[in-house]
C-alpha cells in the first residue's frame, strides 16, 4: 500500500532559522500537501511536479523545494514563533495517505534549552482518521461515508 | 467544513453541449483539488475529471477529448464544459474536493436523450 515516509519527527529551532522537512512516496501520485494541522487545518503549500507550487500567503517568499514530488523537501525559512505546529504530508493518490506528522518548535533564542524534541513521533491521533474502504458510497448517505479513491477513475 | 454546490444539468440532446459549475463555500479554495464525479442509475460513481491547484488537468478515459474542465480561483468555481454528448453521459454530477472526506453535494442531474 501507499505510504508518506515524513521526517524529521521533530525538531527544535530558534526565531528566524530554517527547517527542513521531507517527504517521501513510492511514486504513483499527483501532488502533495503540506499542512498544518490545529482546530482548523491550513493547507501551506501543493507542490506537483511541473506545475508552479502554490502557497500559503503566510509562507510566501520563505519557501523553498528540493527534489520531486515523490521525495520532496521542504525548506521554510525565517521561522516565527506563530509557525510552532504539527506539519503533516498529505499525497493526492487513489487513497489519500498522510505522513507521520513533523512537530517544528519555533523558540527564542534564550529559551532555547527549555524546549527539547523527544524522540517519539508527532501522536497520530492528530492526523485525519484513513478511509475504511473503497467502496463508493449511494449519493443518499454518502455524506456520513469515507471518501471514495480520490483518482481511481484516472491514470 | 466545506460545502458544495453543483448547478448547470439539464436535458439536452445527443451531440449538444452543457457546462457544470460548482460553487464551494469556505476558504482556501485555491488550495482544492477539485473533481467532478458521476454517477449513472444502477452503477458506481466514478470520478470523470479533476483539476489540481496548479490547474494540471485528468480526465477518464470515457470523456477525454470531449469534456473540458476548469476553475476560477476568485468565484471559488469549479466548471465542467462537457461537449458532444452522449446518451450514455446521463448521470447525477458531483463536484468533489479531493483533499479532504467531506459530505458531498446534492448533484446535478444531466440527461441526454433525443
Known amino acids: 500500500a501507499q505510504e508518506v515516509q515524513q521526517s524529521p519527527h521533530c525538531t527544535t529551532v530558534p526565531v528566524g532559522a530554517s527547517v527542513n522537512i521531507t517527504c517521501s512516496t513510492s511514486g504513483g501520485l499527483r501532488g502533495i500537501y503540506l499542512r498544518q494541522l490545529g482546530p482548523q487545518p491550513q493547507d501551506i503549500i501543493y507542490y506537483e511536479d511541473g506545475v508552479v507550487p502554490t502557497t500559503d500567503r503566510r509562507f510566501r517568499g520563505r519557501i523553498d523545494f528540493s527534489g520531486s514530488q515523490d521525495n520532496l523537501t521542504i525548506t521554510m525559512h525565517r521561522l516565527q514563533l506563530s509557525d510552532t505546529g504539527t506539519y503533516t504530508c498529505q499525497a493526492i493518490t487513489e487513497v489519500n495517505v498522510y505522513g507521520s506528522g513533523t512537530l517544528v518548535l519555533v523558540t527564542e533564542e534564550q529559551s532555547q534549552g527549555w524546549h527539547r524534541c523527544s524522540d517519539a513521533p508527532p501522536r497520530a491521533s492528530a492526523l485525519p482518521a484513513p478511509p475504511t474502504g473503497s467502496a463508493l458510497p449511494d449519493p443518499q448517505t454518502a455524506s456520513a461515508l469515507p471518501d471514495p479513491p480520490a483518482a481511481s477513475a484516472l491514470p | 467544513q466545506v460545502k458544495l454546490e453543483e448547478s448547470g444539468g439539464g436535458l439536452v440532446q445527443p451531440g449538444g453541449s452543457l457546462r457544470l459549475s460548482c460553487v464551494a463555500s469556505g476558504s482556501s479554495f485555491h488550495f482544492a483539488f477539485m473533481g467532478w464525479y458521476r454517477q449513472a442509475p444502477g452503477k458506481q460513481r466514478e470520478l470523470v475529471a479533476d483539476i489540481s491547484p496548479g490547474n494540471s488537468t485528468n480526465y477518464a478515459d470515457p470523456v477525454k477529448g470531449r469534456f473540458v474542465i476548469s476553475r476560477d480561483n476568485a468565484k471559488n468555481t469549479v466548471y465542467l464544459q462537457m461537449n458532444s454528448l452522449k446518451p450514455e453521459d446521463t448521470a447525477v454530477y458531483f463536484c468533489?474536493?479531493?483533499?479532504?472526506?467531506?459530505?458531498w453535494g446534492r448533484g446535478t442531474q444531466v440527461t441526454v436523450s433525443s
Open positions: 468533489r474536493d479531493l483533499r479532504s472526506w467531506g459530505a
